[in-house]
Interface confidence: medium
């Protein structure tokens, strides 16, 4: 019946204008949760994380015109209040109480006890079969408007089936009887008498049956799909494969960049042997005594045996301290130790394949031309 | 403070049905309250019939349930008893009375008698 | 079904007197349990709830007592207004059920 406007309303009405509807409510960061255990205590705690390290204390009363008491039987977490079980004592009676730190009131309010009913779970559960159904009772609880909820399944079914009842008298028909059946009943409180925030009791232990004989369990049970575990791995692994795609083309676009705003200088000594220590830089001869044929290699340790080169007219590219880079800490590794960085289109591990006038070199970053 | 207010046929024909209604006023019918019927026969004790919670949910005594039913009217602020094939051993004061929550009978209409006789 | 009994189903006594009348559930009922007056064209009227606490306006000769089976409803001095029927009625459990009730008439 929704949310009981006019049951709420009128009990909004008695506690003088104070309800606040669900089973928590907040001021100063105190959030309150109460449970009425089968009428008999009822447990009230509280999650004040502005007060975790304080021992809150409880007082209460049955009765508006009453003194307060303070609570006699706290919970403790961590070693700090955070609860208080009570004997009720009576059953349908609001609860009038106050939280406080030493002597100022951290949160007060009042409540109908009942709202927030838990039921005992069911005793004596008993099965009595006959043909391809069960009649599953248990002993009804001494107090009305509840709901006995039984669920089965077999292995062959993918969830639990339910059937319930405002009795603890269920019977079950269209079973199966060569199939092995689990069962576990609960009790409800009925939401159109209690509200909507009563809490259901504890499943009582499951018990598995077939041919009419108890089981120790049924073997064949399959677990049950998780498809939203499945799921979830299948999107992890989606956005880390994006991710990983995003990052080598982020680099390899910074590459390109870098490329184009800092173009690669050829090492003279290096791409052209002889150059120098033959022809003392002169282009013409060099070209005439090597015959048009240039030569394509690059020392392994080609940089670190040469000593640093003087730019012998311009020097077109900035020292690599100062160039920008954005690498992730793997690239960064790989440079450091002499290590290329390798990139699908590069065809050659030494460097850039570069023509000129009609003649191809090999070309790395340290290279420069010349002009 | 509650009140409440008993109406219907003071004689009904054996097996017929028994209609009575209890207005309920100086309170709220929707209140955390059930709204009971009880009936005493001459001379006899108190004999729990049944009760309604304003949202429709019964309770009846077996020894008279497939005989009874009780409805409530919140837009009347009323509840009824009917009570269907009557005999003479249905003769008596029927009284409505308001129950708390799991509780006691805490308030009570005066009566009236209902007398089953052809 | 839980049965109530009460005695005993007549007393007499006089006014001034103590009185006692028991009632004994067939079942434990813990405390819920309720003491009624009833006086001859009357409705019952609430006298003690939960075995032993007196309700608003109800005079303080009257106490209950008992848990489990067995109560008490006791009058310390009876008063001429005391004279009519007495019941017990259990609330533990569905159906709800009184006792057969205790006529306390002057001797």
């Known amino acids: 019946m929704g949310r009981l406007v006019l049951l709420w309303g009128a009990a909004v009405f008695l506690l003088g204008g104070w309800m606040a509807l669900g089973q928590g409510g907040a001021a100063e960061g105190v959030q309150i949760q109460i449970i009425y255990f089968n009428l008999e205590t009822v447990q009230v705690t509280w999650n004040a994380s502005k007060y975790s390290r304080t021992n809150l204390t409880f007082h209460y009363r049955f009765n508006g015109d009453e003194a307060y008491d303070q609570c006699t039987n706290y919970l403790l977490q961590e070693g700090h209040t955070s609860g208080c079980l009570l004997d009720a004592e009576q059953r349908d009676d609001i609860l009038y109480f106050s939280i406080r730190n030493g002597t100022h009131p951290v949160f007060t309010a009042s409540r109908w006890m009942v709202y927030y009913l838990k039921p005992s779970s069911p005793k004596h559960v008993r099965f009595s079969w006959h043909q391809d159904a069960v009649t599953v009772t248990c002993s009804d609880l001494s107090y009305g408007d509840l709901l006995y909820e039984v669920q089965y399944r077999s292995p062959f079914d993918t969830e639990w089936q339910s059937k319930q009842e405002n009795t603890c008298n269920v019977t079950i028909e269209g079973l199966d009887a060569e199939k092995c059946y689990s069962f576990w009943v609960r009790v409800k409180a009925m939401e159109d008498v209690y509200g909507p925030d009563t809490y259901p009791s504890d499943w009582s232990e499951v018990t598995c049956w077939q041919r009419g004989e108890i089981r120790d369990a049924c073997a064949e049970t399959p677990t049950p799909p998780k498809p939203k575990l499945s799921k979830f791995i299948l999107i992890s692994s989606l956005a880390i494969l994006l991710m990983v795609s995003l990052l080598l083309l982020s680099l390899w676009k910074l590459w390109r960049v870098k490329k184009f705003l800092i173009p690669s200088v050829p090492d003279p000594k290096s791409i052209f042997p002889g150059l120098f220590e033959i022809h003392q830089g002169n282009f013409q001869e060099w070209i005439t005594d090597t015959q048009n044929v240039a030569h394509l290699h690059k020392m392994a340790g080609a940089e670190q045996e040469s000593g640093p080169e003087e730019p012998l007219v311009v020097q077109l590219a900035k020292t690599e301290a100062e160039s920008p880079r954005m690498l992730d800490p793997q690239t960064e590794e790989k440079e450091a130790s002499g290590g290329s960085l390798q990139l699908p289109h590069q065809p050659l591990q030494g460097g850039d394949v570069v023509t000129i006038g009609g003649f191809t070199f090999v070309m790395n970053d340290r290279s420069y031309v010349a002009l | 403070q509650v009140q409440l207010q008993e109406s219907g046929p003071g004689l009904v024909k054996p097996s017929g049905t028994l209609s009575l209604t209890c207005a309920v006023s100086g309170g709220s019918i929707n209140s955390n309250n059930w709204w009971s019927w009880v009936r005493q026969p001459p001379g006899k004790g108190l004999e729990w019939i049944g009760d309604i919670y304003h949202s429709g949910s019964t309770n009846y005594n077996p020894s008279l349930k497939s005989r009874v039913t009780i409805s409530v009217d919140k837009s009347k602020s009323q509840f009824s008893l009917k009570l269907s094939s009557v005999t003479a051993a249905d003769t008596a004061v029927y009284y409505c009375?308001?129950?708390?929550?799991?509780?006691?009978?805490?308030?009570w209409g005066q009566g009236t008698l209902v007398t089953v006789s052809s | 079904d839980i049965q109530m009994t009460q005695s005993p189903s007549t007393l007499s006594a006089s006014v001034g007197d103590r009185v006692t009348i028991t009632c004994r559930a067939s079942q434990s009922i813990t405390n819920w349990l309720a003491w009624y007056q009833q006086k001859p064209g009357k409705a019952p009227k609430l006298l003690i709830y939960k075995a032993s606490s007196l309700e608003s306006g109800v005079p303080s000769r009257f106490s209950g007592s008992g848990s489990g089976t067995e109560f008490t409803l006791a009058i310390s001095s009876l008063q001429p207004d005391d004279f009519a029927t007495y019941y017990c009625?259990?609330?533990?459990?569905?159906?709800?059920?009184f006792g057969g009730g205790t006529k306390v008439e002057i001797k």
């Open positions: 009625q259990q609330y533990n459990i569905y159906p709800l059920a």
């Open positions: 009375a308001r129950r708390r929550w799991l509780q006691h009978f805490d308030f």
